[in-house]
């Protein structure tokens, strides 16, 4: 009888089923929905998390202007197809044979088509801009304190290497967090910026994916940082391909 058997849960993903049937009675966890093995020492991929969710019952101080190629996730939730490593498959289709191409964070990057649509490769999202607006406070937060707290959060809670947090911008009440991670920069074992951003997004919404941890309690020098609006922009290594009709709509 081991400690693993006493507490056989996945600290980094509560959307799992775990049982102590691994080597030496160790805890082995599988994601809901897909049944895929989950590494509980790190973040679970966004694709597996979305699949689990669908299976469950219901430096300059100036702000960044997202580029014309930035994507926002307007399509919302869908039941994705994940590859054997838990990443999004480049082509996603729904039950009515409508298909589209997605990037590495699962956001649609082409017009919708039929089963003949081809998505040759999974295009990497290398730059994520998280745009937050905080609730009114007595005064503005100190920028360097805010910067340090958000960097600490991504390092400690989401295990994202500090080099991938490119910048934190602040103009009260807007905070922007820039995450950058090129294919060449991401080493084996590195948390993906898309996964970190998704965990952060769920935390901000009060829907923490961590097992048994309290919700996110963000404080800057003891002052609560309460977010009232979140927008996330995704920039891909190859610009998306939408028809002019969509761009002018």
């Amino acid at each position: 009888h081991t400690a693993a058997q006493d507490n056989c849960t996945c600290p980094t993903n509560k959307m799992t089923v775990c049982s102590p049937d691994g080597p030496g009675g160790r805890c082995q966890c599988r994601a809901l929905g897909s049944g895929m093995a989950v590494d509980c020492s790190t973040l679970t991929s966004k694709c597996l998390l979305l699949k689990a969710r669908m299976s469950a019952p219901k430096n300059a101080r100036t702000l960044v202007r997202p580029s014309e190629h930035a994507l926002v996730d307007n399509d919302g939730l869908y039941d994705p197809d994940c590859d054997p490593e838990g990443r999004f498959k480049a082509r996603q289709c729904n039950q009515t044979s409508v298909c589209w191409c997605v990037n590495s964070v699962g956001v649609r990057r082409t017009d919708k088509g039929d089963l003949s649509l081809r998505c040759d490769e999974l295009v990497r999202t290398h730059h994520i801009l998280i745009d937050l607006r905080h609730r009114p406070t007595a005064g503005a937060f100190n920028h360097s304190d805010l910067d340090a707290e958000l960097r600490r959060l991504f390092r400690e809670r989401y295990r994202l290497h500090p080099k991938f947090v490119a910048a934190v911008h602040y103009e009260q009440p807007t905070i922007q967090i820039e995450l950058r991670q090129n294919t060449s920069q991401k080493a084996a074992g590195d948390v993906d910026i898309g996964d970190a951003a998704y965990y952060f997004e769920r935390d901000i919404k009060g829907e923490s994916l961590f097992q048994g941890r309290g919700g996110l309690d963000l404080r800057v020098r003891g002052e609560p940082l309460q977010v009232e609006r979140t927008l996330i922009y995704y920039l891909d290594e190859i610009p998306p391909k939408f028809s002019m009709k969509r761009l002018t709509a």
Epitope: A3, C10, G22, A37, D39, C40, E85
Partner: nanobody, 121 residues
Framework: QVQLQESGGGLVQPGGSLRLSCAAS????????MSWVRQAPGKGLEWVSY????????YYADTVKGRFTISRDNSKNTLYLQMNNLRAEDTAVYRC??????????????WGQGTMVTVSS
């Protein structure tokens, strides 16, 4: 790119033996923990046996303990599973997997396509 290629499966009578091999490439095999897992028809993946990177520690599922032996040759980047006294319930697709073991948790992150083992008279 991680690649795992199993071989050695086949049809064998109850009580018989087989030796499976798994050729690994695309990652530093000599520093990777490895496992054998199996999937019986219509069932989920079942962990069978585990070996650490230098071969000094092994574990076996209760269902195969005393009958199966896991080993590895790091100079050849190859993992082995010697299966003796085979039973009908051992019939499954056998896959080798790269694994990770901590004090409390176990996970596999890459699997081969598998080799079929059928035990029947």
């Amino acid at each position: 790119q991680v690649q795992l290629q199993e071989s050695g499966g086949g049809l064998v009578q109850p009580g018989g033996s087989l030796r499976l091999s798994c050729a690994a490439s695309g990652f530093p095999f000599s520093s990777a923990d490895m496992s054998w897992v199996r999937q019986a028809p219509g069932k989920g993946l079942e962990w069978v046996s585990y070996i650490n990177a230098d071969g000094s520690k092994t574990y076996y599922a209760d269902t195969v303990k005393g009958r199966f032996t896991i080993s590895r040759d790091n100079s050849k980047n190859t993992l082995y599973l010697q299966m003796n006294n085979l039973r009908a319930e051992d019939t499954a697709v056998y896959r080798c997997a790269r694994a990770k073991l901590t004090d409390t948790h176990y996970v596999e992150d890459y699997w081969g396509q598998g080799t079929m083992v059928t035990v029947s008279s």
